[in-house]
């Protein structure tokens, strides 16, 4: 409507006596500027004047006057939006309604706000969810319809009289819409707060208090349970009886089932608040509780541990580890229910006791072969001893023992016989599933554990063999002392240390390698003749026709063995000369004459010196001396040298005789 | 209505045997209850005697002093539990009350509350 | 055996008077303790089991407390009808360690 001027303000205000009241108030004139402004209290409209009357609390005017209720009065606005009020302090008989009288150039307003002031500081309002649960937060908020600058207030929780721990969030407002005080509270409820009493206390600023307002708790919770049991211990033996008491000390709402529940699995038929165990067993042994429900949930006890004692059950023995391999450690574990846990125990091995063996663990440190067969043990408890079980096998594995090697052959084995040869031993776990032999060779395993060796070596010495399952055990290595005949006999020259001159003294030995048996004979041959049987061949003073083709043999009782044949060559210096003339000693002149120096020498004739009758050397130095034509004057005796790298050798004198020709006899 | 009721001689004479009976009205003997005897001497206190099982097992508990000389026995069929004490003395002069117990026993030992009580006879031994 | 043992032998007190009454057993019972109220010439009245519960029909100004071995009956505002003896009793047993029923030695409330 165009023609109303517009105000916002709370519709009611609320204060009590001696407080303030602020009153938060905008406005729009309909035209300019206000230019006067009228607090009245409870104002009535004189239709008489067109005037209100009424007590004035306030007035301002174009000429200034101020009443003297001014100064507790206070129009905190301006000339064209605010209309802020306040009133400080405020009294019991300011209740009922303000009258705020505007007027601007042309136009005029009365605008009614309500004041309710009450002799006493008026209570705040708790407000709580509409159901409050355990453990879920809730908010609870205390409302006070008041808030003013000149007047300070605080709201404190309280709960049982106690302040409340919790930090409260105060927050005020002072706003055209509204004027308030609240207090708000997280807090989250334990069924134990069900039924207690919650208050907020308004208070002023040195924390006197004002007024309150107080709510009672109801938190509602699932059943709060107290499980009694006899005996209190919990602690029975077979055949014994048990009564377990369930007492609901809060439940809100009421309960409306109760149920008995062990090791969290409901019991069947068990519906009242006392379960009866009679003649217990020792599989009723375990956690029991009560579960009681409303409609938040069920509530369940604490758990009681019932333990129904009994003598040990036959015993079962666990090994840590089987198979256990020897000289490893393996540990026995007398495992038996029994309730109290068995205090003393008997340990047995193949059905004899253990001596000293008390402890419900065995340990053997260092596991032999022996320690392999059957485990047992019987627990004892104060009710009594248990009964032996069946046992457990210890199964001690190890590598094969005295493992041998052994030669099948008659003695001696020679070279070239076949030799078969097993491995045993006497003793393995596991089972043996392969051998291996060293040395390693191209032989037959004709089955499991036999070596056939085919045309043995002179040099098979020594053989081993291991027998293997999970590991390998080798035996010694047996020696196969083959026997063969002597081997790599050769000729070798111990002396001279340099080449043979004639007339050295000479040594040849025979060699050989080896031999076995050991014992050997010797025989030296030249050309197919026999010339010692000796190791070595001697020559005191060895001639050139010495030189030749010698071969030595060794033999033994297995065989014998030749050396390849050895060439024995003599030096000397050239012997045997002679001059020998082709074609012969007469010769025609005129014809050809040769004369060849012939010699035995070793090594051969390196150079030849030719000789006349008168000693004199002649100027040829081959073997053959080439007359031609000869002359009578070639007639005579000639000789020869041949010379080598040992000596010197002379020919006897071979006399040329050069006859006439016809021709020249027919001159003559 | 659920009651007990004692009866005996009243007068024994010493070495003799004594013998009381408990008729128990209203309670079902198969349910979770003993049936037990407490004596009181006259002017002294409250002395625990023996308990039995009614129900089919008739498990007896006796406090440790009472083993031997007293006997509890039932009959299911009456609802009825007896008292046997051989070799009185003077010293057995008492008030025996019968009562309803709710517990638990085993191995000889029992323990249970006494809810119901009757209201006791007064055996007297003198010559 | 368990021996209970209760004090005092003899309580002087006055109506309204709050009453205390203890009883110490020589084992560990939990909370399996039961108190009786006897008039002269009467049968034992039950009042509580397992140390706390009051037994039915039983006034609210009667409560027990306590377990193990210390245990407590209160009176809280003593009535005339509560003048009488007051007997524990362990209702505890074990087989285990050899124990059962046992009543204390009495406990006589009397007019001061």
């Known amino acids: 409507d165009s023609s109303k001027w517009v105000f916002e303000h709370p519709e009611t205000l609320y204060a009590w006596e001696g407080a303030c009241v602020w009153i938060p108030c905008t406005y729009r004139a309909l035209d300019g500027d206000l230019e006067s402004f009228i607090l009245f209290h409870n104002p009535e409209y004189n239709k008489n004047t067109s005037k209100f009357d009424g007590t004035r609390l306030y007035e301002s005017t174009k000429d200034g006057k101020v009443p003297s209720e001014q100064k507790r009065v206070q129009f905190l606005g301006d000339k064209n939006k605010n209309c802020t009020l306040s009133i400080h302090p405020v009294h019991l008989n300011d209740s009922g309604q303000l009258g705020l009288r505007m007027e601007s150039k042309t136009e005029k307003w009365m605008e009614r706000i309500h004041l309710n002031v009450s002799e006493r500081p008026f209570p705040p309002h708790i407000q709580l969810p509409p159901e409050i649960q355990e453990s879920q937060e809730v908010t609870l908020t205390c409302l006070l319809n008041f808030s003013c600058y000149g007047y300070p207030i605080q709201l404190q929780w309280l709960l049982e009289g106690v302040p409340m721990r919790q930090a409260a969030v105060t927050s005020t407002s002072l706003t055209i819409k509204s004027v308030f005080t609240r207090s708000e509270l997280k807090f989250s409820p334990q069924w134990s707060h069900h039924g207690k009493i919650v208050t907020c206390q308004l208070q002023d600023a040195d924390g006197k208090f004002l007024s309150n307002d107080t709510v009672q708790l109801n938190v509602k919770h699932t059943p709060k349970l107290e499980i009694k049991v006899t005996p209190s211990d919990a602690i029975v033996r077979e055949g014994d009886s048990v009564t377990m008491t369930c007492e609901v000390s809060s439940s809100n709402p009421e309960y409306t089932t109760v149920s008995w529940l062990k090791d969290g699995t409901s019991l069947k038929k068990q519906n009242t608040f006392t379960l009866n165990l009679r003649e217990v067993t020792k599989d009723q042994s375990g956690k029991y509780c009560c579960q009681v429900s409303n409609d938040v949930g069920p509530g369940r006890s604490e758990e009681v541990f019932l333990q129904v004692q009994y003598a040990p059950e036959p015993s079962t023995v666990q090994i840590l580890h089987s198979p256990a391999v020897e000289g490893s450690q393996v540990e026995f574990l007398c495992m038996s229910l029994a309730n109290p846990l068995p205090t003393n125990y008997t340990w047995y091995h193949n059905g004899k006791e253990m001596q000293g063996r008390t402890e419900e663990k065995v340990h053997i440190p260092k596991i032999l072969p022996w320690h392999a067969g059957t485990y047992s043990c019987v627990a004892e408890n104060i009710l009594g001893t248990g009964q032996r079980g069946p046992g457990a096998e210890l199964d001690v594995q190890y590598p094969p023992k005295k493992v041998t090697t052994v030669i099948q052959n008659p003695m001696p084995i020679r070279e070239g016989d076949t030799v078969t040869l097993s491995c045993n031993y006497n003793s393995s776990n596991p089972s043996v599933t392969r051998y291996e032999w060293k040395p390693h060779g191209a032989w037959e395993e004709p089955s499991l554990g036999v070596l056939k060796i085919q045309n043995v070596g002179w040099d098979n010495t020594t053989i081993a063999c291991a027998a293997c399952n999970s590991w390998c055990s080798w035996a010694s290595p047996v020696a196969l002392n083959v026997q063969y005949a002597p081997r790599d006999v050769r000729v070798r020259k111990i002396k001279p240390l340099s080449e043979i001159h004639s007339g050295n003294s000479v040594s040849l030995q025979c060699d050989f390698s080896s031999s076995h048996p050991k014992e050997v004979q010797f025989f030296w041959e030249k050309n197919g003749r026999l010339l010692g049987k000796e190791s070595q061949l001697n020559f005191d003073s060895i001639s050139p026709e010495d030189a030749g083709s010698y071969s030595c043999w060794v033999n033994n009782s297995i065989g014998q063995t030749a050396s390849k044949a050895w060439t024995l060559e003599v030096l000397y210096a050239p012997r045997r000369l002679r001059v020998s003339m082709s074609p012969g000693d007469q010769v025609m002149e005129g014809k050809s004459a040769t004369l060849t120096c012939e010699s035995d020498a070793n090594p051969p004739v390196s150079h030849y010196t030719w000789f006349d009758w008168n000693n004199q050397s002649l100027p040829y130095h081959s073997q053959k001396l080439r007359l031609e034509p000869v002359k009578v004057q070639h007639s005579g005796a000639y000789w020869c040298q041949g010379t080598n790298s040992v000596g010197k050798g002379r020919s006897p004198l071979s006399t040329l005789t050069v006859y006439y020709s016809p021709e020249t006899i027919g001159r003559r | 209505e659920v009651q007990l009721q004692e009866s005996g001689p009243g007068l024994v004479k010493p070495s003799g045997t004594l013998s009381l009976t408990c008729a128990a009205s209203?309670?079902?003997?198969?349910?979770?209850?003993?049936m037990c005897w407490v004596r009181q001497p006259p002017g002294k206190g409250l002395e625990w005697v023996a308990c039995?099982?009614?129900?089919?097992?008739?498990?007896?508990y006796y406090a440790t002093w009472a083993k031997g000389r007293f006997t509890i026995s039932k009959d299911s069929s009456k609802t009825q539990v007896s008292l046997k004490l051989s070799s009185v003395t003077a010293a057995d002069t008492a008030v025996y009350y019968c009562?309803?117990?709710?517990?638990?026993?085993?191995?000889?030992?029992?323990?249970?509350?006494?809810?119901?009580w009757g209201q006791g006879t007064l055996v007297t031994v003198s010559s | 055996d368990i021996v209970m043992t209760q004090s005092p032998s003899t309580l002087s007190a006055s109506v309204g008077d709050r009453v205390t009454i203890t009883c110490q057993a020589s084992?560990?019972?939990?909370?399996?303790l039961a108190w009786y109220q006897q008039k002269p010439g009467k049968a034992p009245k039950l009042l509580i089991y397992?140390?706390?519960t009051l037994a039915s029909g039983v006034p609210s100004r009667f409560s027990g407390s306590g377990s193990g071995t210390q245990f407590t009956l209160t009176i809280s505002s003593l009535q005339p009808d509560d003048f009488a003896t007051y007997y524990c009793?362990?209702?505890?047993?074990?087989?285990?360690?050899?124990?059962?029923?046992?009543f204390g030695g009495g406990t006589k409330v009397e007019i001061k």
């Open positions: 039995i099982d009614p129900a089919s097992s008739g498990t007896t």
């Open positions: 209203g309670i079902d003997f198969s349910s979770y209850y003993y």
């Open positions: 084992q560990n019972i939990g909370s399996g």
């Open positions: 397992y140390a706390s």
């Open positions: 009562a309803r117990a709710y517990g638990s026993g085993g191995s000889g030992y029992i323990g249970c509350y006494f809810d119901l």
């Open positions: 009793q362990s209702h505890d047993y074990s087989s285990v360690r050899s124990y059962g029923n046992a």
